[in-house]
Amino acid sequence: EAYKSEIAHRYNDLGEEHFRGLVLVAFSQYLQQCPFEDHVKLAKEVTEFAKACAAEESGANCDKSLHTLFGDKLCTVASLRDKYGDMADCCEKQEPDRNECFLAHKDDNPGFPPLVAPEPDALCAAFQDNEQLFLGKYLYEIARRHPYFYAPELLYYAQQYKGVFAECCQAADKAACLGPKIEALREKVLLSSAKERFKCASLQKFGDRAFKAWSVARLSQRFPKADFAEISKVVTDLTKVHKECCHGDLLECADDRADLAKYMCENQDSISTKLKECCDKPVLEKSQCLAEVERDELPGDLPSLAADFVEDKEVCKNYQEAKDVFLGTFLYEYARRHPEYSVSLLLRLAKEYEATLEKCCATDDPPTCYAKVLDEFKPLVDEPQNLVKTNCELFEKLGEYGFQNALLVRYTKKAPQVSTPTLVEVSRKLGKVGTKCCKKPESERMSCAEDFLSVVLNRLCVLHEKTPVSERVTKCCSESLVNRRPCFSGLEVDETYVPKEFNAETFTFHADLCTLPEAEKQVKKQTALVELLKHKPKATDEQLKTVMGDFGAFVEKCCAAENKEGCFSEEGPKLVAAAQAALV
C-alpha cells in the first residue's frame, strides 16, 4: 500500500510515544556529541510535524521521504562544523548520498566516560519529577555510546529501566534495590549492543547472503518443527528489519519488527510450540520475548541427513539446478538436528559441504567422491569442542580475572600493534565467556561460547577498522565471517613485532588507584600487563606471573599505607626496576 505521507504512516503505526523515542534514538546515534537538550528539541519538532501530517497528509512537506526530513533536520544544527568537522560536508550532498555520509561518520568508540549513576535519592527525585525526560536521557545516553544499538530493543530496555525505578523508588533501601537491578540491566544492554553490532557488520561487510545464512541456522535450531519455507519467510523479514535498523531507518525497522512479531504469533502453529506466552504480551515485550524464546523440541521422526544429501543419486542435479535453495535446505536440516552446535560451526559445515559438491560434481564419479562428506566434518566439529573444553578448564583453574589475564597475554602476543585500551577491553570481554558459558551443560557450551566469541571479536574488528595497525587482524576480520574465530585462534606470536621503547610514565601509579572500584582497578593492572608485554614480548608466562604478583602486592601495600602517595612514588620505581631485571 502506498502512503501519501511516509512520516504520517509511521507515526500512526508506532504511536506518539514510540515514534518520539525512536526519533530521539536516531538523532542521538547520528549526532553523538550534541547535548541532550538539543536532541529533545529536534525530536519534539519532528514529532509535532509528524502529528500534523497524520492529521493532514497533504500538508506542506508531508510527502517528503524520512531521510530527507531527518537529514534536513540534522543539517539545521548550528554547531555541526565545530563539533563534527567534515561530517558537516554531508549536508552538501543529496539523498541518498547524504544519509550514507551520516552513517559513515558514526563513531563506534566515541570515548564518553562510563555512565555513573548519581546517588539513589537524586535519581528517584529526577524519575518522579519528569519520567518522560528521565527515560529520554536514558535513551540518549545509550544511543550516543552505541550508534548501532537495535532501536526497538532499546525502547524495551527503557521500559525495563522505568520498571526498576517505579519499584525501587518505593523501597525502604533504594540503593540495595536499584544496585543489582541496574547492573543486571547494564550487562544485558552491553550484550545486546555487541550482538546488534555483529549483525550490522555481517550485513555491511559480508552482505545479505551471509546474514540470511546465519539467521537460517539460528532459527532452524530454535524452531526445528517449522518447515523450510516458514524459516525462510521469517529470515527474509528479519533481514529487512535489521538492514533498516543498521541503515539508520529506525521507524521502518521498529514498524516491520512489530509486523514480524504479529506474523509469528498468527502463525505460531507452524513455527513453534513455545510462542504462546510471548504472544499475549504488548508489542515491545512480545518482540523481545520472541527474540529470546527457548528452543522448541525436535520432531521425533527426522530421517538421516545422508539419505537426501549423500545417498540420493540426484545430489549433483539438485545442487546444480538451484544451488542456494539446495544449500539452504542442507543448512536448515543440519541446524535443526544440531542445537548443540554454534551457528558459526554450522555455517562452516555448510561451506565445507558446498566446496565438496563443487569439487565432486565436476568428476566422473560424484557419488564416490562425496560419499564420505559427512564424516569429513569431524575435524571441523572437534576443533571448537576441544577449544571450549581447554579454555573452560583454564577458566575453572584461574577464575574470571586470571582467565582474562591469560587471554590478554595471548592476544597481545598475537597482535601487539593493537592499542592497549582495545586489547584490554576485548580480552576482558573474551574472558567473560568463561563466566557466561562454562557453567552451562555440555550440550550448550559450544553454542554459547563460540557465538559469544564471534560477537566479541567483531568488536575488535570494528575498532581495528577505524585505525588499522595489524595486517593479520585485518586479514582475520575481512576474509570470512564464519572463520574469524578460528583465524584468531590460529594466530601465533607475531615475530615481526619490534618491542616498544620503555616509558616510565606508563608504569607510574598514584594513590587514586586505591579508591577505584574493583573492575577499574583490574583494568589499570591489565593495562600495565599489556604495556609490559609490548615492551618485553618474549616474556614467559612464569615471568609475567611473578611480575604481576609483585605488582598486586605493591598496590595492596601502598593502598594500606598511611602515606599512600608517598608509598607509590617511592616503591613504584623499585618495582619497575625489579620487573625489568626479571624480564631480561
Epitope: D227, F228, A229, D308, E314, V325
Partner: nanobody
Framework: QVQLQQSGGGLVQAGGSLRLSCAAS????????MGWFRQAPGKDREFVGV????????FYSDSVKGRFTMSREIAKKTVHLQMNSLKPEDTAVYYC??????????????????WGPGTQVTVSS
C-alpha cells in the same frame, strides 16, 4: 485427493512473456508447497520454482531466477508462473505439482504427491 488443472502455455518469440496457471481442487491442506517443474524432450524433469501456500515464500532454480515469478491467489486456490525474457532453452512441457512443505526438498520431483497434466511452452528464436 487433490486435482491440479493447468492453463496457459503456447508458442512465443524469444524475449517474450507467458503466464501459466495451476488451479487446485479437492481437499487442500495448509503447509503445502506448489512446485513448477519442466521437462524438455530427452531430458530429466527439472525444478523451476516453488511457492509456499501458507506464506507466499518463493524459491527458484538458478536458470530462471530474475526472469520467472510465482504468485498465488488463495481464494481461487491458484498459483501462477509469470515467465518473462523467455529463451529458446526454456522450451519444455511445464508441470505444476503439490506437496507437503515439511519435507524441505522442494527441488525434488519425488517429494510431490500430486501433479498437473502438463502444458507445452515453445520459445522460438
Amino acid at each position: 485427493q487433490v486435482q491440479l488443472q493447468q492453463s496457459g502455455g503456447g508458442l512465443v518469440q524469444a524475449g517474450g512473456s507467458l503466464r501459466l496457471s495451476c488451479a487446485a481442487s479437492g481437499r487442500f491442506f495448509s503447509r503445502q508447497v506448489m512446485g513448477w517443474f519442466r521437462q524438455a524432450p530427452g531430458k530429466d524433469r527439472e525444478f523451476v520454482g516453488v511457492i509456499s501456500w501458507d506464506n507466499g515464500v518463493t524459491f527458484y532454480s538458478d536458470s530462471v531466477k530474475g526472469r520467472f515469478t510465482m504468485s498465488r491467489e488463495i481464494a481461487k486456490k491458484t498459483v501462477h508462473l509469470q515467465m518473462n525474457s523467455l529463451k529458446p532453452e526454456d522450451t519444455a512441457v511445464y508441470y505444476c505439482a503439490a506437496g507437503n512443505a515439511l519435507h524441505s526438498r522442494y527441488y525434488s520431483p519425488s517429494k510431490y504427491d500430486y501433479w498437473g497434466p502438463g502444458t507445452q511452452v515453445t520459445v522460438s528464436s
